[in-house]
């Protein structure tokens, strides 16, 4: 950066090199160039010469004043006009930053995704700080009092093997940057209560031609958790409102859920599960599309919507259509 240049003098910022966004700041430049009594001192911001708010303090020093400085980062340098020198002489440079102290981290959440081997902790960091902000995640055993600290700049994955102080912990997050430090409330967790079952996936759908056509959604999960509660939500793609069906599920076999739907309409389905009675849900699964047939038997296969074909079966329509979920973070 600009701070690595060889200096023939000194540049400094008041109140500091990193300061609160919107502050008035002063940048001082002091020349110390051999055989040079500067005629003029110039300031540059991001390579552009500043023309206003420059005050000469004495023979070697000048001040540049900014009101309500709002740029997150700027590279400043200053130069001198020396007699008998054709070009300006570089004095020194400095990178400056403005931003905000961190907000108190809140909504601290820790979950263990089944089979991941990790406890994943996330939080709401609050407003953008614009400057380098570090987070320390504290994990303290309620049984042994041992505390582990993890330094990160966003979320953290903590190996469950490193959680050797039993099952009960307190977790809290400390946020710090050059402008301040804040700390979250303590979250009390029990490792057995924060497991999210292995993802539930809708594999296919079929509409069976009967007096009242019915659609069967096939879905499954690799979870080993015995008591699992799930929700399936569905709607016509033209609708805003979801319908939700609840299930107590045993994943020893593929689940089949029946729906009585309107003909010739494109529907979207999603599923999510949680360990029964526990706090955290899976994110909703990928969007699964299925178009119900008209009264004529037809089948839809692979991806969102495909060519239809007549099978002559009682199965009127089959879909295996996915789209990535737009609700990845919905675990609350």
């Amino acid at each position: 950066g600009i701070t690595n240049i060889n200096c023939s003098g000194h540049i400094w910022v008041e109140p500091a090199t990193i300061f609160k966004m919107g502050m008035n700041i002063s940048i001082y430049c002091q020349a110390a160039i051999k055989n040079c009594q500067p005629r003029k001192l110039h300031f540059y911001k991001n390579g552009i010469k500043e023309r206003f708010q420059i005050t000469r303090i004495n023979k070697t020093t000048a001040r540049l004043w900014y009101k309500n400085f709002l740029e997150p980062h700027a590279s400043m340098y200053c130069t001198a006009e020396c007699p008998k020198h054709f070009q300006e002489t570089l004095i020194c440079g400095k990178d400056i930053s403005s931003g905000y102290p961190p907000d108190i981290p809140d909504e601290v959440t820790c979950v263990i995704y089944e089979y991941s081997g990790n406890m994943t902790c996330t939080w709401n960091a609050g407003k953008l700080t614009y400057i380098d902000t570090k987070y320390v995640v504290h994990v303290k055993s309620l049984e042994t009092e041992e505390e582990q600290q993890y330094l990160t700049s966003s979320y953290i994955n903590i190996s469950t093997d490193s959680l050797q102080g039993g099952k009960k912990y307190l977790v809290w997050v400390q946020a710090a940057n050059a402008l301040g430090m804040e700390e979250s409330k303590q979250l009390q967790i029990h490792l057995d209560d924060i497991v999210i079952p292995s993802a539930a996936v809708i594999s296919r759908a079929e509409t069976i031609n009967a007096t009242v056509p019915k659609t069967i959604i096939y879905w499954d999960s690799q979870t080993t958790i015995e008591k699992v509660s799930c929700e399936m939500r569905y709607k016509a793609t033209t609708n805003q409102t979801w319908n939700v069906k609840e299930f107590d599920t045993n994943f020893t076999y593929v689940q089949q859920s029946e729906f009585y739907l309107e003909p010739n309409i494109k529907y979207v389905f999603q599923v999510r599960c949680q360990e029964t009675g526990k706090r955290y849900w899976q994110p909703w699964s990928s969007l699964f599309f299925h178009k119900t047939p008209e009264t004529v038997p037809q089948v839809t296969s692979k991806a969102f919507q495909h060519d239809t074909w007549n099978s002559g079966l009682t199965v009127a329509s089959i879909s295996t259509g996915h789209l990535t979920s737009d609700n990845r973070g919905d675990i609350g």
């Epitope: 041992e146 505390e147 600290q149 809290w172 303590q186």
Partner: antibody, heavy 121, light 112 residues
């Protein structure tokens, strides 16, 4: 068995700087641990000053009254923690203890013998 | 800021008799509480940690109880060597930037 040995008593003038030390033996300095400093003014109770957490990263914590007044540091390579002042005041006259459990708990199984700091003009 | 409040501040005791000191935290500290004894001219020594666990080498006449905000240190039969100042200490967290002190004010135990 962990032992904490503190540097000797100091007599200083107001405005002078000072750095006192606490050398730990028997601590696994590759593990996570807290090393803390406690002040006891003449005839008074124990006052927590701050701690340094040494692990995969280093973090320092200060009592709000001690922030900006003292600096806590540690040199892992020689198993030593430090407490320093850049400008002493007469009110800094006290016994200073370092304390730890040699791990990342905040109760103190082990205490140094104390360093008496006297600040007087 | 968690504030630790001890009572009584002075406790005259009779050898052979029981004694009890109370410590109250201004907010929930779970079982993260320690007790120390500081004998005259000595460094403090740990008696109890995690509210009720006896530190190594501490006689079993000492016991601790409580969780949350209210804690008690009991001496079943006071001995002459138990005189000194007893301090409680919250050991929950020190990372909070507003902490003033983690120790109680101290309880001076002396023989009647």
């Amino acid at each position: 068995e962990v032992q904490l040995v503190q540097s000797g008593a100091e007599v200083k003038k107001p405005g002078e700087s000072l750095k006192i030390s606490c050398k730990g033996s028997g601590i696994d300095f590759n593990s996570n641990y807290y090393m803390c400093w406690v002040r006891q003014m003449p005839g008074k109770g124990l006052e927590w000053m701050g701690c340094i957490y040494v692990g995969s990263h280093v973090n320092t914590y200060y009592a709000n009254w001690a922030k900006g007044q003292v600096t806590i540091s540690a040199d892992k390579s020689i198993s030593t923690a430090y407490l320093q002042w850049s400008s002493l005041k007469a009110s800094d006259t006290a016994m200073y203890y370092c304390a730890t459990s040699g791990s990342s708990v905040l109760y103190f199984k082990f205490w140094g013998q104390g360093t008496l700091v006297t600040v007087s003009s | 800021d968690i504030v630790m409040t001890q009572s009584p501040l002075s406790l005259p005791v009779t050898p052979g008799e029981p004694a009890s000191i109370s410590c109250q935290a201004s907010e929930n500290i779970y079982s993260f509480l320690a007790w120390y004894l500081q004998k005259p001219g000595q460094s403090p020594q740990l008696l109890i940690y995690s509210a009720s666990k006896l530190a190594a080498g501490v006689p079993d006449r000492f016991s601790g109880s409580g969780s949350g905000t209210d804690f008690t240190l009991k001496i079943s039969r006071v001995e002459a060597e138990d005189v000194g100042v007893y301090y409680c200490q919250q050991t929950n967290r020190y990372s909070n930037p507003d902490i003033y002190n983690v120790f109680g004010q101290g309880t001076k135990v002396e023989i009647k």
